[in-house]
């Protein structure tokens, strides 16, 4: 089952030797506590193939081997991202699917995995030293990327093994960033109890909230910790860039593509994917109360992580993303 | 709400050709795959193909290919599925399906097909 | 094509009890395999995806599990409107394929 970051609810302290204070370093440790273990390493996978049947047909698969919540998956290629990299699919498991040529077929295979088909010929051909790169954007660990190519002496109709985590590369300014919070603030929890093991351990109470509420903690952060957020990005190394595709995105578009940028060289900035759709907030979470999924039975094994997805503001039946609770 | 509004029941003869429709309301009509699936009465299912409709590209069940063509008409979110050379055992239930790649969710109420002479 | 089986065609189960559907691919689909509910004159419903994911709406009676190629469809307490044909399809990769499926019949 999907170990959710729910802190405990706490007694308030009795009035006397805590006051606020003490109430503030009784919370603390619980959190961090939650985080400390719930922390995880996720990866990404990657795997080409060359179809043995149209030289000029890739077929790219992706998957996500994490614990989080997978927002949006997005293929490039074309160097790096801030260099020009151009995007060949989007893939949101609710919202659907964009995709610019030469991909085609993008789809959702799992909860945690993609299949992209490449086809093309001329300068929208992919060639077979073309890096593809797949980023999941998932909550708490952020994005996370990683690239996959064709081996320069592959046959066609072989593929390359998927690649994880040799060439994983997280979002490091969130990633780090977290890291170094969470490294940090067990460091603290750990000094937290030591300073406090000869107090008597707070009473719990259970969480008076909705169980379903955090579920969907995703997509209704703070204002603040939603800045944070990023549209996942993945970029392409390749010497065979297609000369035609700058053009391929749409300007303007329906809903949150609107905001999707017209060349992928633009990295998006904050929560653009989703900023021209409202979503509706109780405080700092959202109910789910509409639907989604949830996960039926215990999960299988050597399987990809559960999604949490938007609660969708046109109804109970609007979803089509799965909802993981492990 | 997200409705698929199919065209009504034909009755066509051998050999002739069919035209079903697919209205689609409540959605972004090009971001989702519409699929179309055939059941034939008191059997299983069968996946003909599915189209994007932002570009039209479609992907055949290679059983159908010959025998279905799918297409979009985005202006009125309609999506078509024509069947030629039709012939007894083309009658069935078929159904529009709006889907990415999770399983189906959104089905249309089907659309009855009798091929008789 | 991966070809999706379901060795029951009827499992006759009574209100309240517990019952079990199998399905079995043809090679390994991971965890991507549907479960629908079809009942006379309806269209399928989808109740459950990868295998363990419930839809929206979908009473948590309904279970799944599996992954590979065997996977199973519970229902916990079976209740009368359960009645109906149970369909596994695999989304793993085009052409989608269905199994035969399973009618189950209350006693």
């Known amino acids: 089952m999907r170990t959710e970051a729910q802190v405990p609810a706490l007694q308030p302290p009795e009035p006397g030797l805590e006051g606020a204070m003490g109430h503030r370093t009784l919370v603390l440790p619980w959190v961090l506590l939650t985080l400390c273990v719930t922390a995880g390493t996720p990866e990404v996978w990657v795997q080409v193939r060359m179809e043995a049947t149209e030289l000029s047909s890739f077929t790219i698969r992706c998957g996500f081997l994490g614990s989080g919540s997978i927002s949006l998956v997005t293929v490039s290629w074309g160097g790096p991202n801030g260099a020009g990299g151009t995007t060949l699919a989007v893939l949101h498991p609710e919202r659907g699917i964009r995709q610019w040529a030469p991909a085609r077929q993008a789809r959702w295979e799992t909860q945690s995995s993609i299949s992209l088909i490449l086809e093309g010929s001329g300068a929208s051909s992919p060639c077979a030293n073309t890096t593809f790169c797949c980023k999941f954007a998932s909550f708490p660990e952020g994005s996370w990327e990683a690239c996959g190519s064709l081996p320069p002496s592959s046959d066609p109709g072989l593929s390359a093994p998927p690649t994880p985590a040799p060439i994983l590369r997280a979002d490091l300014a969130g990633i780090l960033g977290v890291s170094g919070v969470l490294l940090f603030g067990c460091v603290y929890l750990l000094h937290l109890l030591r300073r406090h093991k000869h107090r008597p351990a707070p009473r719990l109470q259970p969480s008076r909230t909705s169980p379903q509420a955090p579920r969907a903690r995703a997509w209704a952060p703070s204002q603040a910790s939603q800045a944070a957020l990023h549209v996942p990005y993945a970029t392409i190394n390749t010497s065979c860039r297609p000369a035609t595709l700058d053009t391929a995105h749409p300007h303007g578009g329906p809903s949150w593509w609107a905001s999707l940028p017209t060349h992928a060289a633009h990295r998006p900035q904050g929560p653009a994917a989703w900023a021209s759709t409202p979503i509706p907030a109780r405080g700092s979470f959202v109910s789910v109360e509409n639907g989604l999924y949830a996960q039926a039975g215990e999960r299988p094994p050597h399987t990809g992580p559960g999604l949490t997805l938007f609660p969708d503001p046109r109804g109970p039946r609007a979803m089509e993303g799965p909802l993981g609770v492990r | 709400e997200v409705q698929l509004q199919q065209s009504g029941p034909e009755l066509v003869k051998p050999g002739a050709s069919v035209k079903i429709s697919c209205k689609a309301s409540?959605?972004?009509?090009?971001?989702?795959?519409m699929n179309w699936v055939r059941q034939s009465h008191g059997k299983s299912l069968e996946w003909i193909g599915d189209?994007?409709?932002?570009?039209?590209?479609?992907n055949y069940n290679q059983k159908f290919k010959g025998k279905a063509t799918l297409t979009v008409d985005k202006s009125s979110k309609t999506a078509d599925m024509e069947l030629r050379s039709l012939t007894s055992e083309d009658s069935a239930v078929y159904y529009c399906?709006?889907?990415?790649?999770?399983?189906?969710?959104?089905w249309g109420q089907g659309t009855l097909v009798t091929v008789s002479a | 094509d991966i070809v999706m089986t379901q060795s029951h065609k009827f499992i006759s189960t009574s209100v309240g009890d517990g019952v079990s559907i199998t399905c079995q691919a043809s090679?390994?689909?991971?965890?991507?395999v549907a479960w629908y509910q079809q009942k006379p004159g309806q269209s399928p419903r989808l109740l459950l995806h990868?295998?363990?994911f419930r839809y929206s709406g979908v009473p948590d009676r309904f279970t799944g599990s599996g992954s590979g190629t065997d996977f199973t469809f519970t229902i916990s307490t079976v209740q009368a409107e359960d009645l109906a044909v149970y369909y596994c399809?695999?989304?793993?990769?085009?052409?989608?394929?269905f199994g035969g499926g399973t009618k189950l019949e209350i006693k």
């Open positions: 990868s295998a363990s």
């Open positions: 399809q695999q989304h793993y990769r085009t052409p989608y394929t």
């Open positions: 409540g959605y972004t009509f090009t971001d989702y795959y």
């Open positions: 399906i709006r889907g990415v790649g999770l399983g189906f969710p959104y």
């Open positions: 090679q390994v689909v991971s965890t991507a």
């Open positions: 189209i994007y409709p932002n570009n039209g590209d479609t």
